[in-house]
């Protein structure tokens, strides 16, 4: 008796985040034994579409001309082999930016830090919302946050970080949201500039220096507790 | 589940060095800042000294400063602190603890127990 | 360097009380105050952080206000498992700095 069928990878390109009018493709590969590919999408009508293999086979694509609110939201993938369906696919979280306006985000005190001290990154929107983002550009884990204030709407988020590190240093913006649809963010902030001086860090280079993979819940994140598979995005409530 | 285990305490004369060692396990360790924080036999909490989270950043209380060194190793998922130059007043409990990013350490091993006497 | 100061070492309540501990700062720390709890045992688990967000896992009794210099956690309905001695901390910049202490007993 032979096992399930092993599950299909699921993913997207250019990415899982999309502006809003801008083409997707969502690419589900299975195995050289696929007959057909399903994908299905949360919360709508199964199958959400169809697609025959593209030779060899083993893939198959679900195109999207032009991203709206429609198409965000969670998806899954299946293939078909002549001994039946795979198991599902981990999820992709498909996500639109631009259905809202863009919050500003600022520093205080200042966004010239100095290590070793604290920042806190402010996060404002025009009208009042319940979810703010907060994410660094060339982050391995560009989503640092998601703050959701158990359904109050406000009109700013507060994302502190401490101690400030070099890792810190770099690119900010943000989104915010509704929380009826995390799958739907705003336009994003202009960018922040965080710059970290080096004054409190002491200045001999450590032997085990390696990549960071994050700029750490400083991802700080910066401390995921759920994560939001395939998209690169790592959600944070708070 | 998060879990950091602190191991290398022990007794040791003044001037003397010593070794602890935190094996981190149920997070993504590269992704935090670590730091050590001891705790002395008047039971005050003194933090030690903060790595970040590529080991590229060190930082140290006045009192250890040339004494201590803080290091990381990212892909056996270890946290050390050596200490050399022992003083009594070192005496303390020793806690490793993972930085949330927010200026808290939101989880701390069990400690290890480290006595300076001769 | 920033002081922390708790000015109660110990405070005894009873089961069900409304428990208030405090702590101030020595200069201004911009809400970046921590609650600890250390139990007889040594275990130390974080409470509260940036003054008044609860950490993962903690029971919704357990609160924290303040702003400036003066912060303070409030413990609304005092349970047996709450006997413990509570630290804050600031972490607003490095140094990190804790206050001494308030040990919680039962009357």
């Known amino acids: 008796q032979a096992g399930p069928l092993p599950k299909p990878t699921l993913w997207a390109e250019p990415g899982s985040v999309i502006s809003w009018g801008n083409s997707v493709t969502i690419w589900c590969q299975g195995t050289l034994e696929a007959r057909e590919y399903r994908l299905d999408k949360e919360e709508s009508p199964a199958p959400w579409d169809r697609q025959n293999p593209l030779e060899p086979k083993n893939k198959a694509r679900f195109s999207i001309p032009s991203m709206t609110e429609d198409y965000a939201g969670r998806y899954r993938c299946y293939y078909r082999s002549p001994v039946g369906w795979s198991q599902p696919s981990d999820p992709l979280e498909l996500v639109m930016t631009g259905a809202y306006s863009k919050p500003t985000l600022s520093a205080l005190p200042s966004p010239l830090v100095t290590s070793g001290k604290s920042v806190t990154l402010l996060c404002q929107s025009r009208s009042p919302m319940d979810t703010f983002l907060l994410i660094k550009e060339r982050a391995a884990h560009p989503l640092l946050h998601l703050r959701s204030e158990h359904g109050a709407q406000q009109h700013q988020a507060e994302f502190p970080m401490s101690p400030v590190t070099s890792v810190h240093g770099g690119t900010y913006r943000c989104f915010s949201s509704h929380g009826f649809s995390h799958y739907l963010l705003s336009h994003p902030s202009d960018p922040l500039e965080l710059i970290v001086s080096g004054s409190l860090e002491d200045p001999r280079p450590s032997p085990t220096r390696s990549v960071s993979t994050a700029a750490g819940p400083e991802d700080q994140p910066l401390m995921p507790t759920g994560s939001v598979p395939h998209s690169g995005l790592r959600r944070h409530w708070e | 589940e998060v879990k950091l285990v602190e191991s290398g305490g022990g007794l040791v004369k003044p001037g003397g060095s010593l070794k602890l060692s935190c094996a981190a396990s149920?997070?993504?360790?590269?992704?935090?800042?670590m730091s050590w924080v001891r705790q002395t036999p008047a039971k005050r909490l003194e933090w030690v000294a903060t790595?970040?989270?590529?080991?590229?950043?060190?930082y140290y209380t006045d009192s250890v400063k040339g004494r201590f060194t803080i290091s990381r190793d990212n892909a056996r998922n270890t946290l050390d602190l050596q200490m050399s130059s022992l003083r009594s007043e070192d005496t303390a409990m020793y806690y490793c603890?993972?930085?949330?990013?927010?200026?808290?350490?939101?989880?701390w091993g069990q400690g290890t127990s480290v006595t300076v006497s001769s | 360097d920033i002081q922390m100061t708790q000015t109660t070492s110990s405070l005894s309540a009873s089961l069900g009380d409304r428990v208030t501990i405090s702590c101030r700062a020595s200069?201004?720390?911009?809400?970046?105050l921590n609650w600890y709890q250390q139990k007889p045992d040594g275990t130390v688990k974080l409470l509260i952080y940036?003054?008044?967000r609860l950490h993962s896992g903690v029971p919704s009794r357990f609160s924290g206000s303040g702003s400036g210099t003066d912060y303070s956690l409030t413990i609304s309905n005092l349970e047996q498992e709450d006997i413990a001695t509570y630290f804050c901390?600031?972490?607003?910049?490095?140094?990190?700095?804790f206050g001494g202490g308030t040990k919680l007993e039962i009357k």
């Open positions: 200069q201004d720390i911009s809400n970046y």
């Open positions: 149920g997070f993504t360790f590269s992704s935090y800042a």
């Open positions: 940036y003054t008044s």
């Open positions: 790595i970040s989270s590529d080991g590229g950043n060190t």
């Open positions: 603890a993972r930085h949330d990013g927010r200026g808290a350490l939101d989880y």
């Open positions: 901390q600031q972490g607003n910049t490095l140094p990190w700095t």
